[in-house]
């Protein structure tokens, strides 16, 4: 029998150093988690231990912090070089600033090979792409080999910027000849890394034949066997196993997200490559693991450009933004709509002729926004200033809902109305009516929301039974401020960009903002 | 760290056959690619073809088909070699270079060559 | 068969100077292109890999780039030992070829 270590990452999003327990700013160092230091820390006495051991990443390494928003991708390259990753799969948010933020900084400068079966490009960028990325990788370790191949959610033209010369095809039909190909070159080791989600982890897991283990991202599924060492909640057990059509056990990982822990399988094959058994668990990534010496110091070098471009000038507001709570979680307030324009922004895909975009409506709580921004100051916007109106470090997800959902959500919006509580909704694409004097879960008198298959976006009435795209803060898709049935109710929930990130890169583009209190909240009395 | 060791140089008459070996150490020998290579003096590198030493399959370049023959012994982690029915075309230094067991990024490590020469 | 078309076959250069190596190939290779160096004393070594990525242990004065079938070497300021034989290789398809070669001459 041989043993193989896997240890791998997924959904870092840019958290290059150590965060607090919920992965947002470090505040007490004592009780921080992950960070590239601390996870190199363990890595290498893991390598130092163990003889077989691969350290892999499942994607999304791009986008979540200052440091991507600065450093654009640069910062993952030189980082994971240093950590000596041995193979890294494709996420969709590799591609949050175009195919050219991906090679340019990534793909020109990664030591290590990054892959995915399921992109083909065409075109002009067939030529400037090929050999930067791959479908698979056969990897020497100790004396065998193993094939890894990748994998990529079919959902990144509409998650993500890869423009029109990639195409992303179905993983499993796509991945299917890869691995037919490895097993060809003799390689019967092989690993499915990539970034799809659980669900289709586990898809790939049943109907791939000649897969061994799936190593995935996306979802930030954790999974765990025992007792969890901190706030995640298992969503299965670690491994989790699946039984292929073809009668395999096969093992499916993934270690949550944001680098807070280092996923950690011990696999065991037979001559034949075959899985005898397969057992580990995510390690927690606590302050009990110190933090590598070179590597933080290297983080404190890259760190001293990231407080510069705090301070910059990101663009000029002509308007008070009125982001108080005394606004926000009472009415419509213009730093609302601020935001919401922005997200909505951020997520504009022009992937249909049939549509002018594929979502148009956003809902945010207003206690989520947390200060105004004076204008006074000759109207100067900064990342500092955004930091402190949107101080949780969460993103802007991409969700599906049915309209019976989301009349549920702004009932709740308003259902106790008075008390400046944060589950008052601000809005875009939606214009909504309460009548406070009716009963709380009945104050919504008009729900119209901006069509999207639509040359001319005009608002109709919401459709219960229709399905809806929305843009929201991931607090609320995770059920938040007593959003519970946003939670329970999702048909799909992809995760989006950093926040702050979303509002600066759309000041800088707009220049100058001036955003208006405009009707898209409005009260009424008695009969409407 | 990795090393290719090849045979010392030799001297053949035209029309013989010669066998030159490389052998690797510093890495598992099955699990990469072992290309051949010729350089005729003061000309540039033409490629020959490689072996699998874990797959033994092998790829040649059609211009050497018929001259050159790979073959590999896992067991010493050696690569081999022959060329046949030689002239004095065939004389020039050949090298043995590592490479990627898919072959996506190529011949990464060389030995020192091993140089041929074919006079009578 | 792919021709790859190397310039300049000589050139001569200054310590400190900044100089370009030029491959053309002859048909789409995609970024599948090795730069290699060869010492008087035959000893070859592999710089650069998939058109851009510098193989470990080699100095960063040395950097490949790519403008559409054109592939450069460039070392952006001039070492003694860098004076030696440089070749440009496509492995994208068989059988793998190489350019002619670039004597790095001392002015």
């Known amino acids: 029998a041989w043993e193989l270590t896997i240890l791998h990452t997924n959904d870092v999003h840019s958290r290059l150093e150590q965060t607090s327990e919920d992965s947002s700013k470090c505040v007490n160092a004592s009780r921080c988690m992950g960070g590239v230091a601390r996870l190199f820390t363990k890595v290498q006495q893991i390598r130092r231990a163990e003889p077989n051991v691969l350290l892999l990443d499942a994607g999304d390494q791009y986008q979540g912090t200052i440091w991507f928003t600065v450093y654009k991708g640069a910062e993952v390259a030189h980082f994971m070089n240093a950590l000596r990753y041995d193979a890294m799969a494709l996420g969709n948010h590799e591609f949050d600033n175009g195919v050219e933020g991906l090679i340019e900084p990534l793909l020109k400068e990664a030591k290590f090979p990054i892959l995915s079966a399921n992109i083909k490009a065409k075109g002009p960028l067939a030529s400037q792409i090929s050999g930067l990325y791959l479908p698979y990788k056969v990897l020497p370790v100790g004396d065998e080999v193993v094939g890894i191949v990748g994998y990529t959610s079919k959902e990144t033209p509409f998650l993500s910027n890869p423009g029109t010369n990639l195409v992303f095809e179905d993983e499993i039909t796509a991945l299917q000849p890869e691995v037919d190909k490895l097993k060809t070159l003799n390689v019967n080791k092989i690993i499915a890394l990539g970034h799809s989600g659980f669900e289709m982890d586990k898809l790939i897991a049943q109907k791939v034949r000649g897969v061994d283990v799936v190593v995935g991202g996306h979802s930030n599924t954790f999974l765990y066997t025992g007792n969890p060492p901190s706030k995640e909640v298992p969503a299965g057990k670690y491994p989790f196993i699946v039984t292929s059509d073809d009668g395999r056990k096969v093992p499916v990982v993934q270690a949550y997200a944001f680098g807070k822990y280092l996923g950690y399988l011990k696999i065991e094959f037979d001559e034949r490559g075959n899985v005898i058994s397969s057992h580990g668990n995510p390690i927690l990534l606590n302050s009990s693991i110190p933090e590598d010496p070179s590597i933080k110091a290297d983080i404190n070098k890259w760190r001293i450009k990231l407080d510069n471009y705090s301070t910059q000038e990101l663009g000029k507001t002509i308007v008070y933004l009125d982001g108080s709570s005394q606004s926000c979680r009472f009415r419509e307030c213009n730093m609302g709509n601020l935001i919401c324009d922005a997200m909505i922004n951020n997520n504009l895909r022009h992937t249909d002729e049939m549509f002018w975009n594929h979502v148009s409506m956003c809902i945010l709580n207003g206690g989520g926004i947390r200060s105004p921004i004076d204008e006074r100051n000759n109207g100067t916007i900064t990342w500092e200033n955004l930091a402190a109106v949107l101080p949780f470090g969460g993103t802007f997800d991409l969700v599906q809902l049915k309209g019976s959902t989301l009349k549920k959500a702004f009932e709740h919006s308003v259902h106790r109305y008075g008390q400046s509580t944060g589950e008052f909704l601000q809005v875009g694409g939606i214009h909504v009516v309460y009548d406070l004097s009716r009963k709380p879960g009945d104050r919504v008198v008009k729900l119209d929301v901006l069509c999207t298959k639509c040359r001319v976006p005009s608002y109709d009435p919401l459709k219960m039974d229709e399905v809806y795209k929305v843009i929201l803060p991931n607090f609320l898709a995770n059920g938040g401020d007593g959003f519970q049935m946003i939670k329970d109710e999702l048909l799909r929930h992809d995760s989006g960009d950093q926040d702050i990130n979303v509002v600066s890169t759309y000041i800088s583009k707009m220049k100058v903002i001036y955003p208006a209190v405009e009707g898209r909240i409005k009260f009424s009395t008695g009969s409407h | 760290q990795v090393q290719l060791q090849q045979s010392g140089a030799e001297l053949a008459r035209p029309g013989a056959s010669v066998q030159m070996s490389c052998k690797a150490s510093?890495?598992?020998?099955?699990?990469?690619?072992m290309h051949w290579v010729k350089q005729r003096p003061g000309q540039g590198l033409e490629w020959i073809g490689y072996?699998?030493?874990?797959?033994?399959?092998?790829e040649y370049n059609q211009k050497f088909k018929d001259k050159a023959t790979l073959t590999a012994d896992t067991s010493s982690s050696t690569a081999y070699m022959q060329l046949s029915s030689l002239t004095s075309e065939d004389s020039a230094v050949y090298y043995c270079?590592?490479?990627?067991?898919?072959?996506?990024?190529?011949?990464?490590?060389w030995g020192q060559g091993t140089s041929v020469t074919v006079s009578s | 068969d792919i021709q790859m078309t190397q310039s300049p076959s000589s050139l001569s250069a200054s310590l400190g100077e900044r100089v370009s190596l030029t491959c053309r190939a002859s048909?789409?290779?995609?970024?599948?292109l090795n730069w290699l160096q060869q010492e008087p004393d035959g000893t070859i070594k592999r710089l650069i890999y998939?058109?851009?990525r510098l193989d470990s242990g080699v100095p960063k004065r040395f950097s490949g780039s790519r403008s559409g079938s054109d592939y450069s070497l460039t070392i952006s300021s001039l070492e003694s030992e860098d004076f030696v034989d440089y070749y440009c290789?496509?492995?994208?398809?068989?059988?793998?070829?190489f350019g002619g070669g670039t004597k790095l001459e001392i002015k």
């Open positions: 270079a590592r490479g990627d067991y898919d072959l996506f990024y190529d011949m990464d490590n």
């Open positions: 510093g890495y598992i020998f099955t699990s990469y690619t």
């Open positions: 072996i699998n030493p874990n797959s033994f399959y092998i």
């Open positions: 048909q789409d290779i995609g970024n599948s």
């Open positions: 998939a058109t851009f």
């Open positions: 290789q496509q492995y994208a398809s068989f059988p793998w070829t």
